[in-house]
Structures are given as C-alpha cells and as structure tokens.
C-alpha cells in the first residue's frame, strides 16, 4: 500500500546487449536504461530483481515512479540520483530489498519533487544523519518528502554499529528539521525497544505513524501531544503491557486518531484498570474487542473489554522481612 504504483501501460525494455553500456550523455527523451522497463505514458521505470550494483545513470527525465527493488546496491552515495538535467518529476522512489547497508549524506539530493521514499527490507547498518536532509546545517532546506517507508531496515545483530539503532534512525529523521512536512512514517519490524522521546515532537505534521511489529514495552516517556494531526497510529505486535493515564489522555485528545493495538502482551492486573475503563468508552481504538490479556496466567485470553475492576488485582507486595529468596 505504500509502494509507488503504476498504471498498466506498455513498457519498453532495453536490449540485453546494452547491459554494460552507460551513457555519459544526457538521456534521450525515450531512452530506457539497460535492464530496466520503461513506460513514458505511466511515467514509470522499473529496474526490478536485476542485481544492479548501482543506480542507472541514464534514467529518463520523465520518470515519476522509479522502482529499483530487489537489487544489490549496497551503498547509496551522495547525489545518487543527481542528474543534469535533474530528475525534476521523480515523485515516488522504491529501493526496497536492494541489499543497501549504507545510505550516505545527500543520497537523495537534487530530487525536488520526491514525495514518497521506500527503503524497506534493506539492512541499513549505516544510515547517515544527513541522508534525508542533505547537509549538516542546523536547519536544512525543507525536504519534499511526504511519505517515508522504513520497514524492516534493522541489520543483523552482528552487523550493527556500536550505537543504538533507534538513535541512528532518529538522527536521520530529525537532522536539520528537514522532514517537518513529513505526513507518513513507517518504522515497522525494526526491533525497536524504545522510541526516543524527542522524535515525535519534531515531526509535527505526521498523519500516519506505523510502529508495528517492534519490541516496544512502554510508551510512558513518549508524548503524542504535539501530533495534533495524527490520523493513524499502528502499535500492533509490540511488547506493550499497559497504557497509562497520561498516554490515554493524550490519545483521546487527538481529534482524528485511530489506534491499532492488536497482539500485545497486555498484563491484566490492577495497573490495567484505567486502560480498561478507557477502552470501554473510547472510539479511537480499532478492533478493541480483539484485545486480550497475556498475563497473569489466570487471565490469559480474557477479553479486555469484558473485564471489571474486581478482575484486576495485584498480588500484595510482601515486606522485605517476609520475602523468600
């Protein structure tokens, strides 16, 4: 749903014998890079599953939707899409599943109309803080990006740099305040353990945030207060145990929000009482009738909406002198 789509128009393919030819000249209006399929009518170029190791240099100037999926790009250097004349029409760029492990500063510079970028399913061990902002200025020129899709970009454990993966991603999102206009951000399936507390406050235009299939345990230090335009918040398949009053109040205060909370290991003890009360009253949670307890054992699979305060107890904490080892 997030990838650039194209209409079913006729595609022209370049001949295989041109595979090694790289034109240093500006591309002809109807030229199609080797190993790609092009449709000028659909303004679409597809270079899919061709084991390309670099971005073709001779992309046609008309390209609006560019698929470079299923390749072996490894590194996206600065100005990877800079052309003369520039690719002024390029609006949707899909680089998913292309074995990218490094995206350098300024990789997406000189794409004035780039609206949607999908880097999903790449093991991004090194995402430059300036990958999206293009410069290390404290305030960069605004990026035209409206949708940024970064699902499953976490590299294998042994390939991670000696730093927080969450921190690396957030640094790229916040650098130079270039993404102030971002409206959709997908960060699903990235093993996130936490959400750095400053990230949401600095992306005030977000309408859609997908954090599903991560390992978030708590939202206690996350504030949604500034995300007044948020329309969907996907938190399915995390490790959430309970949502506390502050979070509940913030979510309820967002006028257009829809929240998705399925498949979290909810702990149905006395700390869950406020959330259960809220769930019974709110309309913002989609599929709220599907939410069930995971713990304690005696509550497993009970439906949250069917619980009452008598069900939600906490075992008394014994004074230290009575505790056993």
């Amino acid at each position: 749903s997030s990838s650039p789509t194209s209409s079913a128009s006729s595609f022209s393919s370049s001949a295989p014998f041109l595979a090694s030819a790289v034109s240093a000249q500006p591309p002809l209006p109807d030229q199609c890079p080797a190993l790609c399929e092009c449709s000028e009518a659909a303004r679409t170029v597809k270079c899919v599953n061709r084991n390309l190791t670099e971005v073709p240099t001779d992309l046609p100037a008309y390209v609006r939707n560019l698929f470079l999926t299923g390749n072996q790009l490894a590194v996206l250097p600065a100005g990877a899409f800079a052309r003369r004349p520039p690719l002024a029409e390029l609006a949707a760029l899909n680089l998913s599943g292309s074995r990218l492990d490094e995206v350098r500063a300024g990789a997406f510079e000189h794409l004035p109309s780039l609206r949607q970028l999908d880097l999903s399913h790449n093991p991004l061990a090194d995402l430059s803080p300036f990958a999206f902002s293009g410069s290390n200025a404290s305030v960069s020129a605004p990026s035209p990006l409206v949708e940024l899709i970064l699902n499953h970009i976490v590299p294998p454990e042994d390939e991670r740099q000696n730093r927080s993966f969450e921190g690396m991603v957030v640094a790229a999102l916040l650098a130079g305040r270039a993404l102030q206009g971002l409206r959709r951000l997908e960060l699903a399936s990235n093993h996130f353990l936490y959400l750095p507390r400053d990230v949401l406050a600095q992306l005030p235009s977000l309408r859609h945030l997908d954090l599903s299939n991560n390992s978030l345990v708590s939202l206690t230090y996350v504030s949604f207060r500034n995300l007044t335009h948020l329309e969907s918040l996907h938190l399915e398949d995390n490790a959430l145990k309970v949502l506390h009053n502050g979070t509940l109040a913030e979510l309820q205060g967002l006028p257009h929000i829809r929240v998705f909370l399925d498949n979290n290991p909810w702990v149905c003890d006395c700390h869950m009482a406020d959330m259960v009360t809220w769930l019974k009253e709110t309309e913002v949670v989609q599929g709220k009738d599907r939410l069930t307890c995971a713990y304690p054992e005696k509550m497993r699979n009970r439906v949250l909406l069917e619980l009452n305060s008598a069900d939600l107890d906490c075992d008394p904490i014994l004074p230290p002198s009575l505790q056993t080892s």
């Epitope: 749903s1 309408r207 007044t228 335009h229 329309e231 989609q286």
Partner: antibody
Framework: EVQLVQSGAEVKKPGESLKISCKGS????????IGWVRQMPGKGLEWMGI????????RYSPSFQGQVTISADKSISTAYLQWSSLKASDTGMYYC????????WGQGTLVTVSS | AIQLTQSPSSLSASVGDRVTITCRAS??????LAWYQQKPGKAPKLLIY???NLESGVPSRFSGSGSGTDFTLTISSLQPEDFATYYC?????????FGQGTKLEIK
C-alpha cells in the same frame, strides 16, 4: 498512484433520492478519512463532512447534518454521499477528498436538481 | 463554527508581481490551516498544509505563514498559471470550514 474516482453527473427532480460514489485506489482505503465538499454554481467550497471507512465513524457540518448521509463500503473501497429527498438548492458540484487534510481530490460529480 | 475570512475577495495583478492573500480565523486554530488552488472546471489542489509546509510538487514561489488567527499565502513572483481562486481551510475543530475564496485575475 492515489486516485479518487467519482460517479457521473446526475439530473434529478425535487423529492427524488440520490447516492453518489467515490472509489479510492492506490492506497490503504481503510486508513484514511474521506471528506465531501460542495460547490454551488459560481460559489466557494463548503465542507460537508468526513468518514473513516475503517469503522464508518462520520462527522458532519451542522449545515448538512440531517440533510445528507455519508457512508462507506470498505470491501470495495468506496465512499458515498446520499440524499433521501433532493431540493433544487442541492444543485452543485460535489467533490470527495482524501484525509482530514484534503491531499487528493476526486474529479467531482455534478448534481442538477430541477423540476 | 470557526469562520475564516479571506481578503481580498478578488485581486488583479500582473505576471512577476508579489501577491499576498490573508486568512483570518474567528478563533485560534493552532497550525491546522491549509491553502488550496482551484482553476475553473477543475477540482481544488492542495498547495500548503499546516500553515507553512509546501505540498510536494508545488513551486517554491508559493509560501505560507502565520499563527493563531492570522495567516497569509504569498506568491513571490506570479506566473501565468497562478491565476486562479485560492481558498484557506481550517481543520482545528469541526466543522472544518473554508474561507470564501480569493479570485486572482490578470491585470
């Protein structure tokens, strides 16, 4: 590519009923609100209301509450605007648009109500 | 309902001119303001959202500013294709009202 395609122009008599449609494609239809906007001949834009197709929650402008019904069928990615009894004053161009922020618009449906 | 008042209602200008259109809300609307452009016989098109963010693909000669109740749309150097009607819209509270429009005509 995100597209909203609206049903064709309609000519109706006062008192008749009408349901016009708006079909979304190129995005996850259930995750975005869909709004309706009226533009009477030679006039400005009027916000009528919005619906969330995922759960059919609809919000109306007081000016249109009770006059029209906004609905959606998520199985076919389509939103609807309907009247049970048209008036001559309902004549105008009706647009659907995506999201609370109207970032994509349909091409419009011209509704003419005349005896 | 929040009322939005645009001024002027119509405006004559020449290619190359700098043009400013204002939108005043009857109460504070935070950053929940957008600007749209509509040409005759066409659907409106989003230009600016959240007061000052330029919609992707919109030329940089368009800009938005303001806060609270007073907002402006500026076209730094008018081009022939900019002659159209412009609307502001608030989405801070229901109903999400539009301004009455500003018609920009060739002088």
């Amino acid at each position: 590519e995100v597209q909203l395609v609206q049903s064709g122009a309609e000519v109706k008599k006062p008192g008749e009923s009408l349901k016009i449609s708006c079909k979304g494609s190129g995005y996850r239809f259930t995750s975005y609100w869909i709004g309706w906007v009226r533009q009477m001949p030679g006039k400005g834009l009027e916000w009528m209301g919005i619906i969330y197709p995922g759960d059919s929650d609809a919000r109306y402008s007081p000016s249109f509450q009770g006059q029209v019904t906004i609905s959606a069928d998520k199985s076919i990615s389509t939103a609807y605007l309907q009247w049970s009894s048209l008036k001559a004053s309902d004549t105008g161009m009706y647009y659907c648009a995506r999201s609370v922020l109207f970032d994509y618009w349909g091409q419009g449906t011209l509704v003419t109500v005349s005896s | 309902a929040i009322q939005l008042t645009q001024s002027p209602s119509s405006l004559s200008a020449s290619v190359g001119d700098r043009v400013t259109i204002t939108c005043r809300a009857s109460q504070g609307i935070s950053s929940a303001l957008a600007w749209y452009q509509q040409k005759p016989g066409k659907a409106p098109k989003l230009l600016i959202y959240d007061v000052s963010n330029l919609e992707s693909g919109v030329p940089s000669r368009f800009s938005g500013s303001g806060s609270g109740t007073d907002f402006t749309l500026t076209i730094s150097s008018l081009q022939p294709e900019d002659f159209a009607t412009y609307y502001c819209q608030q989405f801070n509270s229901y109903p999400h009202t539009f301004g009455q429009g500003t018609k920009l005509e060739i002088k």
